[in-house]
Amino acid sequence: AQHVTTQLVLRNKGVYESVKYIQQENFWIGPSSIDLIHLGAKFSPCIRKDQQIEQLVLRERDLERDSGCCVQNDHSGCIQTQRKDCSETLATFVKWQDDTGPPMDKSDLGQKRTSGAVCHQDPRTCEEPASSGAHIWPDDITKWPICTEQAKSNRTGFLHMDCQIKGRPCCISTKGSCEITTREYCEFMHGYFHEEATLCSQVHCLDKVCGLLPFLNPEVPDQFYRLWLS
């Protein structure tokens, strides 16, 4: 059986849309599948790598690598998207390409970044972890760390940094898929909203779905003990 909820929810483009949330109901009138997984049910993607989920994560990452920051021209906000999802007339798509990116580092002026920009994250304005010395962030945004401390400056002069961010990673469904969404949409979809991150590649959704003890390597499920828990 399915339980369908419909609600007007604030979406990425800053407008309210009618959204459906379909929940698979427990035939035995008990906890939901998400709750059961959290309680230690035998859910194979939490025990060992699931090829289908792995493919999904890789596909999400490939898309994210090509994403940019979509900044609304009316200063209403910005969100990480694909170029096709960013209005050509109402927004500006900030994407480093054709030598428009910053240098990799102040010591390496000639090599320019081509991966990015990322809404509210930039190697030039992140103090912790700083992109410098032996720890220069790679030219692949899907390998960027979460910035835990921004440089103390009200404005940077960069469109993708001075905008109000409207979406962050949200882990939705038992498949551990991730979307950049508004908090409202994420909560309505019963997802896990990552306030601290800017990109889906910075969060490990399956780890969140499975709960219990975190995976030793966030990318490799290792909860073999589930076999004895349930």
Partner: antibody, heavy 123, light 106 residues
Amino acid sequence: QVTLKESGPGILQPSQTLSLTCSFSGFSLSTFGMGVGWIRQPSEKGLEWLAHIWWDDDKYYNPALKSRLTISKDTSKNQIFLKITNVDTAETATYYCSRIGNYGSNYWYFDVWGTGTTVTVSS
Amino acid sequence: QIVLTQSPAVMSASPGEKVTMTCTASSSVYYMYWYQQTPGSSPRLLIYDTSNLASGVPVRFSGSGSGTSYSLTISRMEAEDAATYYCQQWNTYPLTFGAGTKLELK
């Protein structure tokens, strides 16, 4: 308001060491991303970049002069220093220090300059 | 090192006249920076990243170019624009400046 002021010996002899100080206010060199550089200008001539130093103590020198240059900072006193050893009469110039900015820029630029200090190298 | 050649070395213009000066790099650079120095004063940043006006710079100034060829334009010359203009690159160490273009008031 950001200001920088250079000070030096005014006059010195060839082969001596030139010591320059740049005292600044309105910003701190301990702030992430901040930098200050030295540029000189012989009378009625063009500008020549000498060196610059960053908040994280990263230092960059003009390779043509590198063996004779030393840049350093005293963050607590809001000062940077430049030493040039074994000076020559051709190094008579106005020496400027300048803050390095990058507001809205993919690279950096010298956004605020000091008034300069005139140094004469003469025997 | 990248050599920046500015031309002309000296030029003059009447008030209201359009002025264009060029800066040619010995090898390709991503961006050009322009500074203005009036007699007896320190240099002042005019343009960064080739075409962006620095804070407080009048809109009659504009910059353009790419690769090895860059230019600075003053749409309508004013008396206070009489100065020496320097281009600068931040593409490769050592950082280098052009020899300057001296703009005089006719």
